[in-house]
Structures are given as structure tokens and as C-alpha cells.
């Protein structure tokens, strides 16, 4: 029978038929930076080319006995998970291995850097199709390793890395903390985070998604026909590298941003038991388990969005947190969240020619997060319209006044320390969906976008009695671009998007009382692109899966900003 | 990468004309920073990645590395250039005493220096 991990990444509609994906990934080359490998193993023979690159530290111990089977174990297994004949994800992918880890699985940042440089030079000398680089390793946070990954990603290479096996925040490790890298945590057959003793998979905002990483059967370096089960975030990353190879083979022109959005979009949602994660990390950790797309094309019509959390601002009164999108993504909305509820809102502002989302801490607050909603919107022209605090008691409001511009998100920011909970909730007048409404002492920021065929609508869910969480979701075919709360009063901890659902969190019910002051409304802005849908339909007639991405060609900007991580 | 662990005496003589003070001091207000792994057991002191500013050319990287060697030699320190980076990041990998970090951070074109550290199979 099909191993549990391969079944898990197979689209649900095919599981009944024991669906086996085709020998995908044939147009893609996957570079593996790991231990030495047993290239004549039957699983990977002829699929993996061992490069002459080797940069490893001495094994500890002057008389260390180099045993080939131990030395090759990690790398051989991962090569098998990516492209193995029987137990591989992308059975058609070709691989190249670089040795950066010694027989004890240990390497150096400098050796890894030289390896990444080797890949870049190889790419320049002999340009091939899409490249995926698998980094199944982790060290402490390294500015230089992250910078090298950023540069390689900027050169069009897709980097996939292990989140780390330290049961810790992945942002404390590299290359896991590099924003441009696709960082993968590990889950087991029950879709639970992988545990081993006091350790286990890393988590947090620097993880993009999870994938199978416990008891994964793959090639064993014991012998050329041996298999063995191994566990770890390396195995999880290898699954995602394989899925990425399949996706890139079907659509070779996909950019890193497009690939990441698709990986997120096709993942299984909300299946991980978040109780395993530390409480403060649950909201930051993506509840996503990687899966292959249901087919090689047909995703192009979708408006893809993801949620990007900033680093924590820290507790000082004027502290701010900034969340950024990738260069070829549009920031369509900005929200903020504070566990203490003490915050001064958020605003979208220009930085280096690109919009960023900045959240503001308040006096006595323990700090805030900025949450950006980052979307793939070709040929988009977005701007922010701001209204200063209003004099009238009706509250502040701002709308998209330019012809053809639609509202994609609302933010509010206030200078006063406490907006108070004594003002009645502000209700949006009917027939004016294209405007943002907020507290009269807050400045309001509307994100207004023009893009071919873009249409958006506002969806609200209000609860008169106080409740810790209010949610509102977009319907099938619509994508959540904006998420905010009405009113922006002090008992609201903040708002954030989880997949296609807008979540508004409020203070513990017991502290707010049950008066009408506790009323909270979650406001979702749901959008879709008729232009993308139309382009997709036109493509359905052709047999080729490539060309889908021609739609996305309009906006390819180099990722030159070194920014906080993503979901 | 050729071995730079050559005759230091010769290197010092060749660069004798350079004063101990830096000929090309870093631009005013930009201070290079030093980084090291927060996890102490993973640190590898004695090996450093010197990262140069983004637009630095390979020839400037090599010149900066030679300058570091010359200035270190004058102070009685041996250094070994292990690799000169170009293609992804400009800079070089150097084996040297941590005592030389202050000197290295003042070299022209230096953006930051990071102490090497371990990475592990996951």
C-alpha cells in the first residue's frame, strides 16, 4: 500500500483510487546540500548526480571511523524522499548533491555559503530550467546565511529548508528564518506536530507550512536496495521540495511568490492540533500541511493571498512592528494584534517604494504584531487613502474615490493611549460598502486597488454580547484580502486573517462585562478577479499547463528588501 | 582559491608604504557590525566571514583581504584567507585571532563580520 506520507500529500479526490501522481518534476533540478549520498541506491540511481563539491568540518575525534552507511544515511534518505523511484514525491526530478555535512551530520555556515555560491555559479555557467535548493540543515540565526539565501532567491532559485528539530521558534535558526526561503515544519500520520522527547519540530511565524516528517520510509544507505524510516524536519522539507518540483514542472515560469502562494493554497487547512505549540506561538504558526495540487493547471484564476506576521515589536511605548510582502506581492490590507489589548492600531505606509504594514504599541502594552495580507494581483495599482481623526461623533470614514478602484482593506491608527470602550459601535451606512469606518479619534487608512477585473465586497459579522473571538469567512471563489474590527475600541486585541477567515479577538469576556460596550463586528473584505478567471478559461482549451503564468508576468520585481518572515 | 598562507614577511614589505592608519577609511557614519551565533556551543571562533558592501567588486574583495593580512602581520598576527566570495555576496572567509576583529571592522568596504558557526542535519 502507498506509504502514509505519500497518501497525505495526494489530493483528497484521488485517494479513493490510490492515485499515483505522474512521474512529475522532470523539468526541474533539485540541489541537495547535505551529507554524502549513496548514488547507486536503486531508489535514486541515475537520478542523482554527485557534484565534486565538498566542504565539511573534520569529524570530532582524530580516529573517527568513517563508515559509509552512517556518512551517507541522511542525504541518501532525503534524495529518496524527493525523487525516489518507489517512495519519492517527484519521481521525475533530477538531483545534484553537494556535501556540506560530515559523517556526524555537522557542517558550518561558511561551508554552506560556499555551497550556495557554487550553485549560483553553476546556474550562470549552464542555465537550466527551474532550480530548487533543499537545505535540510539548521544552525543558529545567521545574518550572512540568510543574506546568501536572499540573493539566491532573487536570482530565481526556490530554496526549501527544514524548520529545525529544536521545539523552538524557527526564527531563532538559519536558514529557517530567511524570509525568502520556504521553511517547513514536520507533522506525523495523525497530522500532529512531530515530537521526540523534549524536542520536536520548530514552529512560529518563520514556518511557511508543515509536511510529513515522522517515520518516513525512504532509501537506506545500508545497501542499494535497503529502505529505512527516518524522522525530522529535513524529511518534511524534502516533501515540499518534491511538491515544488512537481508544480514547477507543470508551470516552469512560476515565480517564488507564486509558488509559495500555491503551496499555501493547496495545503490541508486547520488539521494540526495547535495545543502542542506554546500558547504565544499558536496564532503565529501556520496550520497548514502541504499537499500536491489537484491538477497541473486550473489554479491561475484564483486570487492568492497569504498572511504575513511581523516580529514582535517589544514592549516600549513607541515600539512598532513592520510586516512586509514579497516584492511581487501586493499589500492589500494591514491589521494589528496585541495580547494585552494595548495598542495604537496600524497603518500602511510606503518604505523603499513599497507599501508595508506598521503596527504601534501603546503605553503599558506588552508589544504588538503587524499582520500583512499579501496577495498576487497582476497589473495592480494600489494606493492608501487616509482620513485624519474626525471632529464629528459619527466617527472617521474614508473611501476609494478614484474611478475603477476597489477597497481591499481598512486600517486604523490612533495617537491617544486608550480609545475607550464607552463610544457606541459605529455602523456603516447602507449602500456605502467602499469605505472604511472607524473611531472618531483614529485616523483611517483605506487600501484602494485597481486591477483588471478585480471586484470586492464587504462582509460583516457582528456579535452584540462580548465574545473572545468573532469570525467571518469569504465564500467559495472569493479570497479574503482585508480583515478588521468595528469598533477599534480598547477591548479588541486585534484582527488577523487565517486562510479565508477574518478573526477578531477581544479581551477575556470576564474583564469586559456583558454590556453593549462589548459588541464587536468582524469585517472581511472578499475579492475575486474576473480577469484571472477569464484568462484561466481561455487556457483550459489548450493542452499545455504552461502559459498560465503569463498572466503573472506583468509584475516581477526583484526582492531586494531584507524583511521579516511570512506565513 | 589559491592558498594565501604565504610568506608574511614578504607581504609586509610589499605593503610597507601603507600607513598603519587606514588609507580608505569607511564612509562617515557607517559602522561595520560583528555578529556571532547566540548558541554558544555552536560557535566556531577563529574563523570569520567578512561581508563587504553590496556593490564591492571581486578585485576590491581581494584587496581588502590582503590589507587585513598586511595590517595583522604588522601586529604580529598570522591570518589565512580560506575563500573569497563573489557571485552571491562579496567578501571573504578568514582564519584569524578574534583580537583582530576591531581592526577588520574598520577596513574599507566592510559591511559586517560574522563568526563562523555549526549547522546540523535536521
Amino acid at each position: 500500500s502507498i506509504p502514509w506520507n505519500l497518501e497525505r500529500i495526494t489530493p483528497p479526490r484521488y485517494r479513493a483510487d490510490e492515485y499515483q501522481p505522474p512521474d512529475g518534476g522532470s523539468l526541474v533540478e533539485v540541489y541537495l546540500l547535505d551529507t554524502s549520498i549513496q548514488s547507486d541506491h536503486r531508489e535514486i540511481e541515475g537520478r542523482v548526480m554527485v557534484t565534486d563539491f565538498e566542504n565539511v568540518p573534520e569529524e570530532d575525534g582524530t580516529r573517527f571511523h568513517r563508515q559509509a552507511s552512517k556518512c551517507d544515511s541522511h542525504g541518501t534518505h532525503l534524495a529518496g524522499v524527493v525523487s525516489g523511484r518507489d517512495a519519492g514525491v517527484a519521481k521525475g526530478a533530477s538531483m545534484r548533491s553537494l556535501r556540506v555535512l560530515n559523517c556526524q551530520g555537522k557542517g558550518t555556515v561558511s561551508g554552506t555559503l560556499i555551497g550556495l555560491e557554487f550553485i549560483r555559479k553553476s546556474q550562470l555557467v549552464q542555465p537550466v530550467g527551474p532550480l530548487v535548493v533543499l537545505l535540510p540543515l539548521a544552525g543558529g540565526y545567521s545574518r550572512v546565511l540568510n543574506a546568501a539565501c536572499q540573493r539566491l532567491a532573487r536570482a530565481g532559485v526556490v530554496l526549501v529548508t527544514a524548520a529545525g528539530n529544536f521545539r523552538d521558534d524557527a526564527c531563532l535558526y538559519s536558514p529557517a528564518s530567511a524570509p525568502e526561503v520556504i521553511t517547513v515544519g514536520a507533522t506525523n500520520a495523525q497530522d500532529q506536530p512531530v515530537t521526540l522527547g523534549t524536542l520536536g519540530t520548530n514552529f512560529g511565524r518563520c514556518v511557511d507550512l508543515f509536511a510529513p516528517g515522522e517515520d518516513i520510509i525512504g532509501a537506506s544507505s545500508d545497501c542499494s536496495t535497503c529502505f529505512v524510516s527516518q524522522s525530522g524536519t529535513s524529511q518534511a522539507a524534502a516533501h515540499v521540495a518534491g511538491i515544488a518540483a512537481m508544480m514547477l514542472s507543470a508551470e516552469p515560469e512560476l515565480t517564488l511568490a507564486e509558488l509559495r502562494q500555491r503551496l499555501i493554497h493547496f495545503s490541508a487547512k486547520d488539521v494540526i492540533n495547535e495545543a502542542w505549540f506554546p500558547e504565544d506561538q499558536r496564532v503565529l504558526t501556520p496550520n497548514l500541511v502541504a499537499a500536491l495540487p489537484p491538477s497541473t493547471h486550473g489554479a491561475g484564476w484564483q486570487l492568492f493571498c497569504r498572511t504575513v506576521w511581523s516580529a514582535h515589536s517589544g514592549p516600549t511605548r513607541m515600539a512598532t512592528a513592520v510586516a512586509r510582502c514579497a516584492p511581487d506581492e501586493e499589500l492589500l490590507s494591514c491589521s494589528s494584534f496585541s495580547r494585552s489589548g494595548k495598542r495604537r492600531g496600524e497603518r500602511m505606509e510606503a518604505q523603499g517604494g513599497k507599501l508595508v504594514c506598521r503596527a504601534h504599541n501603546a503605553f503599558g502594552g506588552e508589544g504588538v504584531y503587524a499582520i500583512a495580507r499579501c496577495c498576487l494581483l497582476p497589473q495592480a495599482n494600489c494606493s492608501v487613502h487616509t482620513a485624519p481623526p474626525a471632529e464629528a461623533s459619527m466617527g472617521t470614514r474614508v473611501h476609494c474615490h478614484q474611478q475603477g478602484h476597489v477597497l481591499t482593506g481598512c486600517s486604523s491608527h490612533w495617537e491617544v493611549e486608550d480609545l475607550g470602550t464607552h463610544k457606541p459601535p459605529v455602523l456603516r451606512p447602507r449602500g456605502q460598502p467602499n469605505q472604511c469606518v472607524g473611531h472618531r479619534e483614529a485616523s483611517i487608512h483605506a487600501s484602494c486597488c485597481h486591477a483588471p477585473g478585480l471586484e470586492c465586497k464587504v462582509k460583516e459579522h457582528g456579535i452584540p454580547a462580548p465574545q473572545e473571538q468573532v469570525t467571518v469567512a469569504c465564500e467559495e471563489g472569493w479570497t479574503l484580502t482585508g480583515c478588521s474590527a468595528l469598533p477599534g475600541t480598547s477591548h479588541v486585541l486585534g484582527a488577523y486573517a487565517v486562510d479565508n477567515t477574518c478573526v477578531v479577538r477581544s479581551r477575556d469576556v470576564s474583564t469586559t462585562g456583558s454590556t453593549s460596550e462589548g459588541a464587536v463586528t468582524a469585517v472581511a473584505i472578499c475579492c475575486r478577479s474576473r480577469h484571472l478567471a477569464q484568462a484561466s478559461q481561455e487556457l483550459q482549451g489548450s493542452t499545455s499547463g504552461s502559459g498560465l503564468n503569463d498572466i503573472f508576468e506583468a509584475q516581477k520585481i526583484e526582492w531586494h528588501e531584507h524583511h521579516h518572515h511570512h506565513h | 582559491q589559491e592558498d594565501e598562507d604565504g610568506d608574511y614577511e614578504e607581504l609586509v614589505l610589499a605593503l610597507r608604504s601603507e600607513e598603519d592608519g587606514l588609507a580608505e577609511a569607511p564612509e562617515h557614519g557607517t559602522t561595520a557590525t560583528f555578529h556571532r551565533c547566540a548558541k554558544d556551543p555552536w560557535r566556531l571562533p577563529g574563523t570569520y566571514v567578512v561581508v563587504l558592501k553590496e556593490e564591492t567588486h571581486l578585485s576590491q574583495s581581494e584587496r581588502t583581504a590582503r590589507r587585513l593580512q598586511a595590517q595583522a602581520a604588522r601586529r604580529g598576527y598570522l591570518t589565512k584567507i580560506l575563500h573569497v566570495f563573489h557571485g552571491l555576496l562579496p567578501g571573504f572567509l578568514v582564519k584569524m585571532s578574534g583580537d583582530l576583529l576591531e581592526l577588520a571592522l574598520k577596513l574599507p568596504h566592510v559591511d559586517y563580520i560574522e563568526e563562523d558557526s555549526s549547522v546540523f542535519a535536521q
Epitope: G61, C226, G232 | A121
Partner: antibody
Framework: QVQLVQSGAEVKKPGASVKVSCKAS????????IHWVRQAPGQGLEWMGY????????KFNQKFKDRVTMTRDTSISTAYMELSRLRSDDTAVYYC??????????????WGQGTTVTVSS | DIVMTQSPSSLSASVGDRVTITCKAS??????VDWYQQKPGKSPKLLIY???NRYTGVPSRFSGSGSGTDFTLTISSLQPEDFATYFC?????????FGGGTKVEIK
């Protein structure tokens, strides 16, 4: 649950052979190497070797190389260890153990209950 | 073969005592050392893997440390169920080798 169940105690004469079985359940048998470790009365543990059940690959401690045979039957998820030309100092409890690989860590996470082999004339 | 020398070979302690067992490798084995507990008539049970990582379900009073050639197993506060024999084992190179064992007895 995951377990290894070994065959019962054996009494053998010097020069004879003994074959101990180890039946695995609760996991994919071919996914883990099965190691054999013995313990003489009142003594420490001694590693004998292992078999990778996904093939027939074996690795032995040189001390036992000429006398030990390790086999497996995947249809019944069972590993076997046969020790020939028995001597009195082979009297011991023989354990099978499953080796697990996590990250770059290796350890025996599941052990059989042990099989006592007594060699006596 | 790598020799693992365990000390002491036996010790007597009381409930609540802090107990330290050491293991010395004849050559550097990095952190490729596991610790096992064995009770009379029972199979060994994994406590610590890779020198310092506590295995699933093992109480927090057990901790391991060391790298290279010197390794330590510490029981911070001895409990009645901890009276047993403890073994270290290296997996840095074949053949795998075990220490001679440390028997922890009730004083």
C-alpha cells in the same frame, strides 16, 4: 502498540546452533533495522549486529562474524538471529531491538523481552 | 573498538539524592551516546539519546550532558523506581559498544 515479541528460552549443548525469533507488530517492519544485543549473566550489554528487513543487508560485530546469521521473513514481520558452534560463554539473554533514526540521532527505542539461551553439556 | 568506561560500577544512594554517573569513551564520539536503564529481569529502556536529549515519557529528573569523550547521566532527585542498572552506549562507529553498567542500589 509498537512491540517486539521474542521466542522462548532455549537450552543447547556446546557445538549446537540456536535460532531466536523476534516478531514485530504495531509498525512498518521494513522501515527499521533490527539489532541484536546480548547480556551474559550479571554482565553488561554486547552488540552483535543488525539486519535491515527491507532487504537482506546485515552488519555484524567482528567478534561474531563467522558464527552469526541474521535473516527475516517480511510476510510475518519476523527477524531471526542464529548463532552456531555454541560455547558455554554464549549463555546469555539475547535481545532484539528496533533502531530509530531521528534527525541525525540513532537509538534503540523498542526492545524485545529477551530470550534466555543456556549452553550446557 | 571504542571502549566505554563507566563509573562507578555501583553506588548506594537514598531517595531524594542527586546521583551522577559518568562514561568515558576511549576516543571522541561527538555526541553519539545514548543512555539506557535496566531493571532486573527486564529489557533496557531508553532514557537519553544523543548525549543530552531526554526521550519521550522520561521524567525530567533524568538529564544527560557531555560531548567528545566525557559523558554524564544525572538523576537530580532519586525516586524509588530509579533503583536499577544504567548503561551508556556509543553509536559513533561500529561495532556499537556499551559501558559496563552502573548499579544504583538503595542505601
Amino acid at each position: 502498540q509498537v512491540q517486539l515479541v521474542q521466542s522462548g528460552a532455549e537450552v543447547k549443548k556446546p557445538g549446537a546452533s540456536v535460532k531466536v525469533s523476534c516478531k514485530a507488530s504495531g509498525y512498518t517492519f521494513t522501515g527499521y533495522t533490527i539489532h541484536w544485543v546480548r547480556q551474559a549473566p550479571g554482565q553488561g550489554l554486547e552488540w552483535m549486529g543488525y539486519i535491515n528487513p527491507s532487504s537482506t543487508y546485515t552488519k555484524f560485530n567482528q567478534k561474531f562474524k563467522d558464527r552469526v546469521t541474521m535473516t527475516r521473513d517480511t510476510s510475518i514481520s519476523t527477524a531471526y538471529m542464529e548463532l552456531s558452534r555454541l560455547r558455554s560463554d554464549d549463555t546469555a539473554v539475547y535481545y532484539c531491538a528496533r533502531e530509530r533514526i531521528y534527525s541525525n540521532y540513532w537509538f534503540f527505542d523498542v526492545w524485545g523481552q529477551g530470550t534466555t539461551v543456556t549452553v550446557s553439556s | 573498538d571504542i571502549v566505554m568506561t563507566q563509573s562507578p560500577s555501583s553506588l548506594s544512594a537514598s531517595v531524594g539524592d542527586r546521583v551522577t554517573i559518568t562514561c568515558k569513551a576511549s576516543q571522541n564520539v561527538y555526541t553519539a551516546v545514548d543512555w539506557y536503564q535496566q531493571k532486573p529481569g527486564k529489557s533496557p529502556k531508553l532514557l537519553i539519546y544523543s548525549a543530552s536529549n531526554r526521550y519521550t515519557g522520561v521524567p525530567s529528573r533524568f538529564s544527560g550532558s557531555g560531548s567528545g569523550t566525557d559523558f554524564t547521566l544525572t538523576i537530580s532527585s532519586l525516586q524509588p523506581e530509579d533503583f536499577a542498572t544504567y548503561f551508556c552506549q556509543q553509536y559513533s562507529s561500529y561495532p556499537y559498544t556499551f559501558g559496563g553498567g552502573t548499579k544504583v542500589e538503595i542505601k
